[in-house]
Interface confidence: low
Amino acid sequence: EELQVIQPDKSVLVAAGETATLRCTATSLIPVGPIQWFRGAGPGRELIYNQKEGHFPRVTTVSDLTKRNNMDFSIRIGNITPADAGTYYCVKFRKGSPDDVEFKSG
């Protein structure tokens, strides 16, 4: 069965200054490739977290993404402010050359 990306929470309400937990799980380890979190959609979407690389000072992962069989890609965003409001997407990429290819979005 083809991999599905599941974001079970349709909305998350967080008080200013608190931490938001955004849940995301994949139903399969195949295809191989990283997960990225975005706010908004389209080419101008804002990258919130990239499993592969980058510097995301307010983001921590709920589980250890380095573990080979991990399928939990949930993240926590600290010190929430009104500027963080928006729709967040958990996106699975398929490993490719030279660039990874977007495979499926939550």
Epitope: H55, R58, A85, G86
Partner: antibody, heavy 125, light 113 residues
Framework: EVQLVESGGGLVQPGGSLRLSCAAS????????MNWVRQAPGKGLEWVSY????????YYADSVKGRFTISRDNAKNSLYLQMNSLRAEDTAVYYC??????????????????WGQGTTVTVSS | DIVMTQSPDSLAVSLGERATINCKSS????????????LAWYQQKPGQPPKLLIY???TRESGVPDRFSGSGSGTDFTLTISSLQAEDVAVYYC?????????FGGGTKVEIK
């Protein structure tokens, strides 16, 4: 009036450090992503760094990665660029620029719609 | 990175005549979901910071005179000044907004003949 004013430029020796500041006024600073863009003497524009409205996402050009640090203080309506290990090739006018779009969540969706006048950084021995 | 190539490097046009600047991207900047091209044009006059003229390849920024127009799609774009005025003497830059990092063209200098 929407305005960005840079400061902190100057003459510094190779290997030295500088901290640039950009003071914003006339708009809701905390709603906008911000950028630093530089222009070497007689040359074109080079994007340097980006910071999202809430500081959750930061990008750097490969040429400055590991040496420059972008930050912001929304309470003070200010953007900063800490520049370490400066090189001669960092000599340029540094502009802060607003990423248009506000709450659109798309940092470059309208281009960079407000620019400061720039501050000059000269790296020379 | 997406490479932006502008032509010509410089352009001399008589007052009141048309000026045309070209910009080519190394890959398409057209986003099929909304049919928008993520390309902007900037004007930089001597001693001044850049000014956003056009975004989405063809949408004029507020306050920009209608003699400035943008066209093109995919990888090939054009900025046209329909009737050159003395105050249009400047360097013009294109910039792609489609992928990080946002990259600029090398610039086209417009002068009066």
């Amino acid at each position: 009036e929407v305005q960005l004013v840079e400061s902190g430029g100057g003459l510094v020796q190779p290997g030295g450090s500088l901290r640039l500041s950009c003071a914003a006024s006339g708009f809701t600073f905390s709603s906008y992503s911000m950028n630093w863009v530089r222009q070497a003497p007689g040359k074109g524009l080079e994007w340097v760094s980006y910071i999202s409205s809430s500081s959750s996402t930061i990008y750097y050009a490969d040429s400055v990665k590991g040496r420059f640090t972008i930050s912001r203080d929304n309470a003070k309506n200010s953007l900063y660029l800490q520049m370490n290990s400066l090189r001669a090739e960092d000599t340029a006018v540094y502009y802060c620029a607003r990423g248009g779009g506000g709450y659109s969540y798309s940092p470059y969706i309208y281009g960079m719609d407000v620019w400061g006048q720039g501050t000059t950084v000269t790296v020379s021995s | 990175d997406i490479v932006m190539t502008q032509s010509p490097d410089s352009l001399a046009v008589s007052l009141g005549e048309r000026a045309t600047i070209n910009c080519k991207s190394s890959q398409s900047v057209l986003y099929s979901s909304n049919n928008k091209n993520y390309l902007a044009w900037y004007q930089q006059k001597p001693g001044q910071p850049p000014k956003l003229l056009i975004y989405w390849a063809s949408t004029r920024e507020s306050g920009v005179p209608d003699r400035f127009s943008g066209s093109g799609s995919g990888t090939d774009f054009t900025l046209t000044i329909s009737s050159l005025q003395a105050e249009d003497v400047a360097v013009y830059y294109c910039q792609q907004l489609y992928l990080y990092p946002p990259t600029f063209g090398g610039g086209t200098k417009v002068e009066i003949k």
